[in-house]
C-alpha cells in the first residue's frame, strides 16, 4: 500500500487514516474506529468498515424466492466487535448488556439475550441474494448483456473470483445477483462474498468506499443502469435460531 509520501491514501477504503510510517517510509493506513492496519490493495472487511462508520461523524419466475431461513439486515447500524483479523465476533453486545449472535456478515441470527448468551461459533453466510430494482428505461435490458456487465463489475471492482457469482436473474425491473461461497471454497486471498456485497451496497447507494473515481458507472450496451432499490438476503450454512414469537 504505497503512495506519494506527501499524500498518502488508501484507494480501497476512504474510512482510514494514513501516514508514511510503514517500512521504508511506505504508506500505512489504519481503519477509523479500530486503528487496525488495513491492506489497501483489497477490500476492507465489513466489520472494520461498520466500526469505522460508527466512529465517523453522523451525517414462472426466474427470480429466486428467498427461503424461510434467509436473513435481512433489519437491525441497521451498530458498533460491532471485530476479531484481530477484522472478522465479526460471533457474539455482539451493546452498551446496555443486550447480546445476540451474528453470522459472518454481521447480521443477527438469534433472539437478543443478556450477557449469559453463548455463541459457540461464527456461522458462515454462504449464499447472498442481492435484489435490485432499476429505474425505468426505454426497454428491458438484454439479459445476457446485463449478466456480463454485473459479472464484470464484481470481478473488476471488488476482485471477487467469477466462480462466486452463481447467477444473475432478471425480470424487468428486478435484478437478482446470487453470490455463493462455502467455507471449503474460499481460499487464502479470496475476497469474501459478504465484503463484496457490502461494497456493492454502498456503491449503489452513492456512498462509495473507494477513493478516486468513486461512484459506479454501470452501463449495459451504453445504456445507464441506475438502481433505485436494494434488498439483500443472507443465507447461513447453519439456519438461524429465532423464537416463534419473532416469526409471527
Amino acid at each position: 500500500h504505497t503512495a506519494a509520501q506527501d499524500n498518502c491514501t488508501c484507494p480501497t477504503n476512504k474510512m482510514t487514516v494514513c501516514s508514511p510510517d510503514g517500512p521504508g517510509g511506505r504508506c500505512q493506513c489504519r481503519a477509523l474506529g479500530s486503528g487496525v492496519a488495513v491492506d489497501c490493495s483489497t477490500l476492507t472487511s465489513k466489520c472494520l468498515l461498520l466500526k469505522a462508520r460508527m466512529s465517523a461523524p453522523k451525517n414462472a419466475r426466474t427470480l429466486v424466492r428467498p427461503n424461510e431461513h434467509a436473513l435481512v439486515d433489519n437491525d441497521g447500524l451498530y458498533d460491532p466487535d471485530c476479531d484481530p483479523e477484522g472478522r465479526f465476533k460471533a457474539r455482539q453486545c451493546n452498551q446496555t448488556s443486550v447480546c445476540w449472535c451474528v453470522n459472518s456478515v454481521g447480521v443477527r441470527r438469534t433472539d437478543k439475550g443478556d450477557l449469559s448468551l453463548r455463541c459457540d461459533e461464527l456461522v458462515r453466510t454462504h449464499h447472498i441474494l442481492i435484489d435490485l430494482r432499476h429505474r425505468p428505461t426505454a426497454g428491458a435490458f438484454n439479459h445476457s448483456d446485463l449478466d456480463a456487465e454485473l459479472r464484470r463489475l464484481f470481478r473488476e471492482r471488488y476482485r471477487l473470483h467469477p466462480k462466486f457469482v452463481a447467477a444473475v436473474h432478471y425480470e424487468q425491473p428486478t435484478i437478482q445477483i446470487e453470490l455463493r461461497q462455502n467455507t471449503s471454497q474460499k481460499a487464502a486471498g479470496d475476497v469474501d462474498i459478504g465484503d463484496a456485497a457490502y461494497y456493492f451496497e454502498r456503491d449503489v447507494k452513492g456512498e462509495s468506499l473507494f477513493q478516486g473515481r468513486g461512484g459506479l458507472d454501470l452501463r449495459v450496451r451504453g445504456e445507464p443502469l441506475q438502481v433505485e432499490r436494494t434488498l439483500i438476503y443472507y443465507l447461513d450454512e447453519i439456519p438461524p435460531k429465532f423464537s416463534m414469537k419473532r416469526l409471527t
Partner: antibody, heavy 126, light 106 residues
Framework: AVTLDESGGGLQTPGGGLSLVCKAS????????MFWVRQAPGKGLEWVAV????????NYAPAVKGRATISRDNGQSTLRLQLNNLRAEDTGTYYC???????????????????WGHGTEVIVSS | ALALTQPSSVSANPGETVKITCSGG???YGWFQQKSPGIAPVIVI????NRPSDIPSRFSGSKSGSTGTLTITGVQAEDEAVYFC???????????FGAGTTLTVL
C-alpha cells in the same frame, strides 16, 4: 483486428494549441476506458490522461492539468486530446491506448493498458 | 509526481531466467517492451499477470504485495529492449510508469 490510429501531430508553436485524434476499430469502443500516453525524445513513458467509457470521468497528469482536455465520441469511435498553451516539454510521441478494466477502483492505472496505437509525433518549437 | 521504481539495467546470457521488479504502485501493474524510442511499445503483460495471445509464453507477470515482477524464462537475443512497468498512484488516482529497465542479452 484491434487498431488505434492517431493523427494531428506535427510542428506546433509554443503557446499555441493542438488537437490529437485517435480512431479506434476492431472492438466495441463504448466498452473501454481510453488513455493518452506520451514519450519525450530519449525519455520514458508518461501517462497523460484517461477518460472512462461514458465520458463522465476524466483525469489528467499534473504536467498537463488545466491545459488538456480528453474527450470521446462513442458513436464515431474516436478519442481526442486537446492541449493548449503548448511548451517545449510537450514535444514527443503521443500514443492512444485502451484500458482493460473499466470498473476497477484503480482503473486509471497504466497497468491495464492492453492496446497501443502507433503514435503521432508532436514537435513544439518556434 | 510519483514514479515507479525499477532497476535501470539487467543483463543475462541466452537461456537464463531474468526477473525485473517494479514497486511503488498501489494497484495493478503492466509491462511494456520498447526496442527503440519513438516506436510504439509492445504490451507483454497487463493487469499483473495477463499475457496477450501474441506474446511468447516465456514472458510472465506476478505481483506480491505492492511489487510487480516480470519474468522472462529462457531469455533470447530478440528480448533485448527497454522494459517499462506501468501502474497506479493511489494518492493522485493517476497512472504512472517506471523509468525503464534496459535488458542486455550477452
Amino acid at each position: 483486428a484491434v487498431t488505434l490510429d492517431e493523427s494531428g501531430g506535427g510542428l506546433q508553436t509554443p503557446g499555441g494549441g493542438l488537437s490529437l485524434v485517435c480512431k479506434a476499430s476492431g472492438f466495441d469502443f463504448i466498452d473501454y476506458d481510453m488513455f493518452w500516453v506520451r514519450q519525450a525524445p530519449g525519455k520514458g513513458l508518461e501517462w497523460v490522461a484517461v477518460i472512462n467509457r461514458s465520458g463522465s470521468y476524466t483525469n489528467y497528469a499534473p504536467a498537463v492539468k488545466g491545459r488538456a482536455t480528453i474527450s470521446r465520441d462513442n458513436g464515431q469511435s474516436t478519442l481526442r486530446l486537446q492541449l493548449n498553451n503548448l511548451r517545449a516539454e510537450d514535444t514527443g510521441t503521443y500514443y492512444c491506448a485502451r484500458g482493460a478494466c473499466t470498473h476497477c477502483w484503480d482503473a486509471d492505472s497504466a497497468g491495464y493498458i492492453d492496446t497501443w496505437g502507433h503514435g503521432t509525433e508532436v514537435i513544439v518549437s518556434s | 509526481a510519483l514514479a515507479l521504481t525499477q532497476p535501470s539495467s539487467v543483463s543475462a546470457n541466452p537461456g537464463e531466467t531474468v526477473k525485473i521488479t517494479c514497486s511503488g504502485g498501489s494497484g495493478s501493474y503492466g509491462w511494456f517492451q520498447q526496442k527503440s524510442p519513438g516506436i510504439a511499445p509492445v504490451i507483454v503483460i497487463f493487469n499483473d499477470d495477463n499475457r496477450p495471445s501474441d506474446i511468447p509464453s516465456r514472458f510472465s507477470g506476478s505481483k506480491s504485495g505492492s511489487t510487480g515482477t516480470l519474468t522472462i524464462t529462457g531469455v533470447q537475443a530478440e528480448d533485448e529492449a527497454v522494459y517499462f512497468c506501468g501502474g497506479y498512484d493511489g494518492s493522485t488516482d493517476a497512472g504512472i510508469f517506471g523509468a525503464g529497465t534496459t535488458l542486455t542479452v550477452l
